[in-house]
């Protein structure tokens, strides 16, 4: 008889897919023009990207570091107006993409939580969530929450109100901390937060060092759901050497958690690459004349144009590693196990019940490597097979879907390897 | 309160334009766009386009492209609507609408409407 | 465009009835209809929108169903202020439409 089939986890529409931050809206669609009924003429591009939220804004009226001009409920006019924010979330709705409201209330000055009345502050930003509630946002996210006195409270208090409307509605909090114990508190008080945070920068970008930094954390959180970025605001050229952009895009698409990247991750936008071009908020590369002032300064290679022209690209890998995201159950929602692997190498199986299953093998090294896989510490639920197909590599030259020999594998230096093999009774 | 006030009804010749106003009161008028609305005798209603008082940008139905030209006036808080080569079939009230605090399209606050009749 | 058909132009009814408008739209509109109450001095008022959420400040007694193509809306204890002329509109895709209007009237 057929072994019973495993019951399906409850799954909310953040743990489908990948979330995208817009943080400067105007940065996003260039040409200085950036607002929000602009904005609606790309969501079709990133329904491309297979992005199940957009992680906007700010967007309410803020005058630097003045409490008394910051009001949460009023969109900037610069953006636009309430209508074309309704406009945008109704085009959104259609096309299966949430959106969320960052509310960072001090977005525009020093201090991003005016330290000297965290209390009123707080209490705007209560009203501030019913009111974006009602209006049919999908949640939200607050930044440099370690600069708010006694955040995890306030952040029980939010998390409530943004549930109590709909357990379908998501809090977001972000934190430049990259300390596992200031992170594990800040969960702990809200079991469906999810956190960004700087914790996988803080990294010697090893094999070894990475597979501890990911193993440590999700023994630290238990089992509730995570996200995965670098930062909770900037673009992952800001932390990573060029030659691991590939590699980290395929790591954070396969772990357990939601992952989290912001708007120019998927062409391996950087910051101030170009002249002229503030550091936070760069402007994204559309095609060659996405900036005019310097003709010459873009080239085809660097643009969502011509990257969508390249098969082997980042943003076609992008594309590639978001649709398999959210289609398949076993990166879905399945069993993470690491095992042991050469030196240099992070390797790890995603496994669901009968589903197919995906091996993942990462070499961080800048030389070829042998991946000497050892499933001796595997589960008996999770044993590799002597032959597992190609899924894609990071790097050009492999034969999608051909078998590859697990006991002779070898990967390329920088090379990250998306596997897949069938589940066997 | 949101309010919509309108101009008074109109009597005009055909070929003739004119021009009415609707007077936003209550909330910050360019947070929301002005749609207008026709309704003939006995009629059902029809949306004849919409104007964002923030940024000046109009859109209309097809139909009303070269009947209807939108506009507003920011320091005065008011939308206006010009008909122009009026004929019998503009004889109507015309609505000036707001939508309310949700996202889905439906127009919450309503004007007391304009009636126009074009007669010789 | 989108076509509201709202077949029945009117309908008459007793006090304390409970009566059911129904609009029809030419193609899915995603949930995106809302009902109109117009009375004889020409006043609208939104009573639904986005198919079944209750306007502000309008009765309970007011309640709106539906899905893909077809919406209806129910007057569950009908009362003499209620005799008013009910519109749907789609506000899924531009141009809104509106359907042509059900006049209820008391029997």
């Known amino acids: 008889r057929a072994p019973r089939c495993r019951e399906l986890p409850a799954q909310k529409w953040w743990h489908t897919g990948a979330l995208y931050r817009i943080g400067d809206l105007q940065a996003f669609q260039g040409h200085g023009s950036g607002n929000l009924a602009g904005l609606k003429g790309r969501l079709d591009y990133l329904s491309s990207l297979k992005v199940k939220g957009l992680v906007l804004g700010p967007l309410h009226k803020n005058q630097k570091d003045d409490v008394a001009q910051t009001d949460l409920l009023q969109i900037d006019p610069n953006f636009g107006s309430k209508e074309d924010f309704d406009n945008l979330l109704q085009s959104a709705k259609k096309k299966s993409i949430r959106v969320i409201l960052d509310l960072t209330p001090n977005y525009r000055g020093e201090n991003l939580w005016f330290s000297t009345q965290v209390d009123s502050v707080a209490t705007k930003v209560k009203d501030a969530l019913e009111f974006w509630l009602q209006a049919g946002v999908d949640g939200f996210q607050v930044r440099d929450i370690e600069n708010l006195k006694d955040a995890s409270s306030f952040l029980a208090e939010w998390e409530n109100i943004t549930k109590g409307f709909s357990e379908d509605r998501l809090l977001i909090a972000g934190t430049n901390s990259s300390d596992l114990q200031q992170i594990v508190s800040l969960l702990e008080s809200n079991k469906d937060l999810l956190l960004t945070s700087s914790y996988l920068s803080d990294s010697s970008f090893t094999g070894e060092h990475t597979k501890s930094l990911v193993t440590q954390y999700l023994n630290a959180t238990g089992n509730r759901w995570c996200s995965w970025s670098l930062s909770q605001a900037g673009l992952l050229t800001s932390f990573l050497p060029a030659q691991l952009l590939r590699l980290y895009q395929l790591m954070l698409f396969t772990l357990p958690g939601t992952p989290v990247f912001s708007y120019g991750d998927e062409i391996g936008l950087k910051a101030a690459a170009l002249p002229g071009q503030p550091v936070e908020a760069p402007v994204m590369l559309w095609d060659e004349s996405s900036f005019p002032d310097i003709p010459g300064a873009v080239s085809a290679n660097m643009t969502v144009k011509g990257q969508s022209e390249d098969p082997g690209s980042l943003l076609s890998l992008f594309r590639q590693l978001s649709d398999q995201r959210s289609k398949e159950r076993s990166l879905l929602h399945g069993d993470f196990h690491t095992f042991s692997s050469g030196p240099g190498l992070f390797s790890y199986i995603r496994h669901w019940d009968q589903n197919e299953r995906f091996l993942v093998v990462l070499n961080f090294g800048d030389v070829g490597l042998s991946a000497g896989l050892q499933a001796s510490d595997l589960p008996a639920s999770a044993s590799l097979p002597t032959k597992a197909d190609l899924v894609l590599s990071t790097q050009p030259g492999r034969e999608e879907g051909s078998p590859l020999e697990l006991e002779r594998l070898k990967l390329e230096p920088h090379e990250g390897l998306l596997l897949r093999f069938p589940y066997v009774a | 309160q949101v309010q919509l006030q309108q101009s008074g009804a109109e009597l005009a010749k055909p070929g003739a334009s004119l021009k009415m106003s609707c007077k936003a009161s209550?909330?910050?008028?360019?947070?929301?766009?002005i749609h207008w609305v026709k309704q003939r005798p006995g009629q059902d209603l029809e949306w004849i386009g919409y104007?964002?008082?923030?940024?000046?940008?109009?859109d209309s139905n097809q139909k009303f492209k070269d009947k209807a030209t939108l506009t507003a006036d920011k320091s005065s808080n008011t939308a206006y609507m010009q008909l122009s080569s009026l004929t019998s079939e503009d004889s109507a009230v015309y609505y000036c609408?707001?939508?309310?605090?949700?996202?889905?399209?439906?127009?919450?606050?309503w004007g007391q409407g304009t009636l126009v009749t074009v007669s010789a | 465009d989108i076509q509201m058909t709202q077949t029945t132009s009117s309908l008459s009814a007793s006090l304390g009835d409970r009566v059911t408008i129904s609009c029809r739209a030419s193609?899915?509109?995603?949930?995106?209809l809302n009902w109109y109450q117009q009375k004889p001095d020409g006043t609208v008022k939104l009573l639904i929108y986005?198919?079944?959420r209750l306007h502000s400040g309008v009765p309970s007694r007011f309640s709106g169903s539906g899905s893909g193509a077809d919406y209806s809306l129910t007057i569950s204890n009908l009362q003499q202020e209620d005799i008013a002329t009910y519109f749907c509109?789609?506000?899924?895709?531009?141009?809104?439409?509106f359907g042509g209007g059900t006049k209820l009237e008391i029997e």
């Open positions: 609408a707001r939508k309310g605090h949700f996202y889905a399209p439906s127009f919450a606050y």
């Open positions: 209550g909330y910050t008028f360019t947070d929301y766009y």
């Open positions: 104007i964002n008082p923030n940024s000046a940008y109009t």
């Open positions: 193609q899915d509109i995603s949930n995106y």
């Open positions: 986005y198919t079944s």
């Open positions: 509109q789609q506000g899924d895709t531009l141009p809104y439409t």
